[in-house]
């Protein structure tokens, strides 16, 4: 018995199909004689150029998903379109992006919220991954909260995952922060600082964002300069003190550790002081003290009389006891340290006779 094709059914090898795989559709319809022509439909729309019993798609794409149906035709007539078959195409999440929810710019210490967005996914996204890994909070699926963001948190990337994970391009957090690792560096001299030296100090820092910075130098809390270098053409002992530098940008300012600048100098401002005074009665005691200002302190003293004769005393104090009238005259001292020598002006000691001596005369 010959008859026109009966309503057709579609068999799919295989559904669900993974994106990129191949799929074959078979149109089955009882007919005698066998169908000679087929019309294929995808979601109700005729597929152009497909007239065979089998349709082969070598590389399936997400848009190939949907209902496939067919109509068979022989010399006796055209069959009816059956209910068709559903092709499910599975694929990783598409167009994944990491989105920063915060207003820009982000500053060190801020709380940063990021979301992981995607365009489509089959099957549904069930989890998210983040790079780098951190002890960060995920308040909800696809949302990351970074509390107290660090200056060195540079980029973050997320992945949306179903059976596969799709990674977004990393997003730059561009965290802004105050200058870091601010330090004073002595450029010149590389050795100890002597009075009269040319001295250069540099204010260094390792990084800053934004890069535009200002420098401030201070000594004992007083502002000295606003350049990265602090220069002394000829340093003096009065320049000694506690120095620090500050670097600031629009986010904040950072200070270096304080550094005590020490100036070494030969003994200066020497003077001979006399006790109990510069007029002493014979027989009493007179103490001459060599007072000076030196760094390092004076290590060696030399005493001289009015004839520039050195005296056999090398301590800071010269004690004359009992003092004699012959001790009257001008004295001076010389102080020596590792830097050099300094001398005092002359100081005159007057020794007068005692009443007893005058009485005997």
């Amino acid at each position: 018995v010959q008859y026109a094709p009966e309503p057709s059914t579609v068999q799919i090898l295989h559904s669900p199909a993974v994106e990129g795989s191949q799929v074959e559709f078979l149109c089955m319809s009882l007919a005698n004689p066998l169908p000679t022509n087929y019309t294929w439909y995808h979601n109700g729309k005729e597929m152009q150029g497909r007239t065979e019993e089998k349709v082969h798609i070598p590389k399936i794409l997400p848009w190939h998903a949907g209902t496939y149906s067919c109509v068979a035709e022989n010399i006796l007539g055209t069959g009816q379109r059956g209910p068709g078959a559903e092709l499910d195409v599975q694929y990783p999440p598409k167009k994944v992006t990491t989105v920063i929810q915060n207003p820009m710019p982000i500053r060190e210490g801020d709380t940063v919220t990021l979301s992981c967005n995607y365009n489509s996914s089959n099957p549904s996204v069930t989890r998210y991954e983040w790079k780098p890994h951190g002890a960060w909070e995920e308040p909800s699926l696809g949302v990351l909260k970074i509390q107290n963001v660090g200056w060195d948190n540079t980029t973050i990337a997320c992945a949306a995952c179903n059976s596969w994970c799709s990674w977004a391009s990393p997003v730059a957090l561009n965290v802004q922060y105050a200058p870091r690792d601010v330090r004073v560096r002595k450029i010149k001299p590389l050795s100890e600082i002597h009075s009269g030296n040319s001295v250069s100090l540099q204010c260094d820092f390792s990084s800053s964002h934004p890069k535009e910075v200002q420098f401030f130098w201070e000594k004992n809390g007083r502002l000295l300069g606003k350049e990265s270098q602090l220069n002394f053409d000829s340093i003096s002992p009065e320049d000694a003190g506690s120095y620090s530098c500050w670097v600031n940008n629009s986010i904040g300012q950072t200070a270096s550790k304080a550094w005590t600048l020490e100036v070494l100098y030969a003994p200066r401002r020497l003077r001979v002081s006399m006790s109990p005074g510069d007029q002493v009665m014979e027989g009493k005691s007179a103490t001459l003290t060599c007072e000076s200002d030196a760094n390092p302190p004076v290590s060696h003293y030399t005493w001289f009389d009015w004839n520039n004769q050195s005296l056999p005393y090398h301590s800071q104090k010269l004690r004359l006891e009992p003092v004699k009238v012959q001790h009257s005259g001008a004295y001076w001292c010389q102080g020596t340290n590792s830097v050099g020598k300094g001398r005092s002006p002359l100081s005159t000691l007057t020794v007068y006779y005692s009443p007893e001596t005058i009485g005997r005369r």
């Epitope: 330090r183 004073v184 560096r185 002595k186 450029i187 010149k188 590389l190 050795s191 100090l201 540099q202 260094d204 990265s228 270098q229 270096s256 550790k257 304080a258 550094w259 005590t260 020490e262």
Partner: antibody
């Protein structure tokens, strides 16, 4: 990244002249001293001298004074070590290094970091 | 000039062991101005310690420095395979700055 890149290995004859270079990058070259250090085959490290590119002030180790010349060109971030007349005993690896440091408290520290990879100089007839 | 003498010349140890390297100065090194460097074959030296005891950036805490005056020590608490190298001390307290002759730490 702070880097010092040194010129390539040299093979010379005794009596010839030579100038090797060290190029700094990733920092303000003019504000850091550069040191030159010699290491003879199988031996230890010897500081030859240092230069401040900002004004080309140079300090030589007395052992090397008059034997070599250290110079710098801050405009191209280069430091140089040169010989006017090489000897076989100049055969060695020569390193340049940045003199880093900082001051705090009452101290000022200095150190060599980073170092170039070295230039091997071979002097042989 | 200050002469630095390192001892021993060679130290033969196994990974995991403790290494103690000595550096003695011919005169006192002011303010502990002493640094330590590590040099592996075919490589440039690398800064480990400055100021006798401060670790340089990125140096593992198994490296420690101590000492003052004329006697200084570098200690590696547990030797790792990458620690076998030559170690140099260097003073920067007085001019000219000088290096010790080095201590080689080799695998036993």
């Amino acid at each position: 990244e702070v880097q010092l890149v040194q010129s390539g290995a040299e093979v010379k004859k005794p009596g010839e002249s030579l100038k090797i270079s060290c190029k700094g990058s990733g920092y303000n070259f003019a504000t850091y001293w550069i040191a030159w250090v010699r290491q003879m085959p199988g031996k230890g490290l010897e500081l030859m001298g240092i230069i401040y590119p900002g004004d080309s002030e140079t300090t030589y180790n007395p052992s090397f004074q008059g034997q070599v010349t250290i110079s710098a060109d801050k405009s191209i971030s280069n430091a140089y070590l040169q010989w006017s007349s090489l000897k076989a005993s100049d055969t060695a690896m020569y390193y340049c290094a940045r003199v880093g440091g900082y001051c705090s408290g009452t101290s000022c520290h200095n150190w060599f970091d980073p170092w170039g990879l070295g230039t091997l100089v071979t002097v042989s007839s | 000039e200050i002469v630095l003498t390192q001892s021993p010349g060679t130290l033969s140890l196994s990974p995991g062991e403790r290494a103690t390297l000595s550096c003695r100065a011919s005169q006192s090194v002011s303010s502990s101005y002493l640094a330590w460097y590590q040099q592996k074959p075919g490589q440039a030296p690398r800064l480990l310690i400055y100021g006798a005891s401060s670790r340089a950036t990125g140096i593992p805490d198994r490296f420690s420095g101590s000492g003052s005056g004329t006697d200084f020590t570098l200690t590696i608490s547990r030797l790792e395979p990458e620690d076998f190298a030559v170690y140099y001390c260097q003073q920067y307290g007085s001019s000219p700055w000088t290096f010790g002759q080095g201590t080689k730490v080799e695998i036993k």
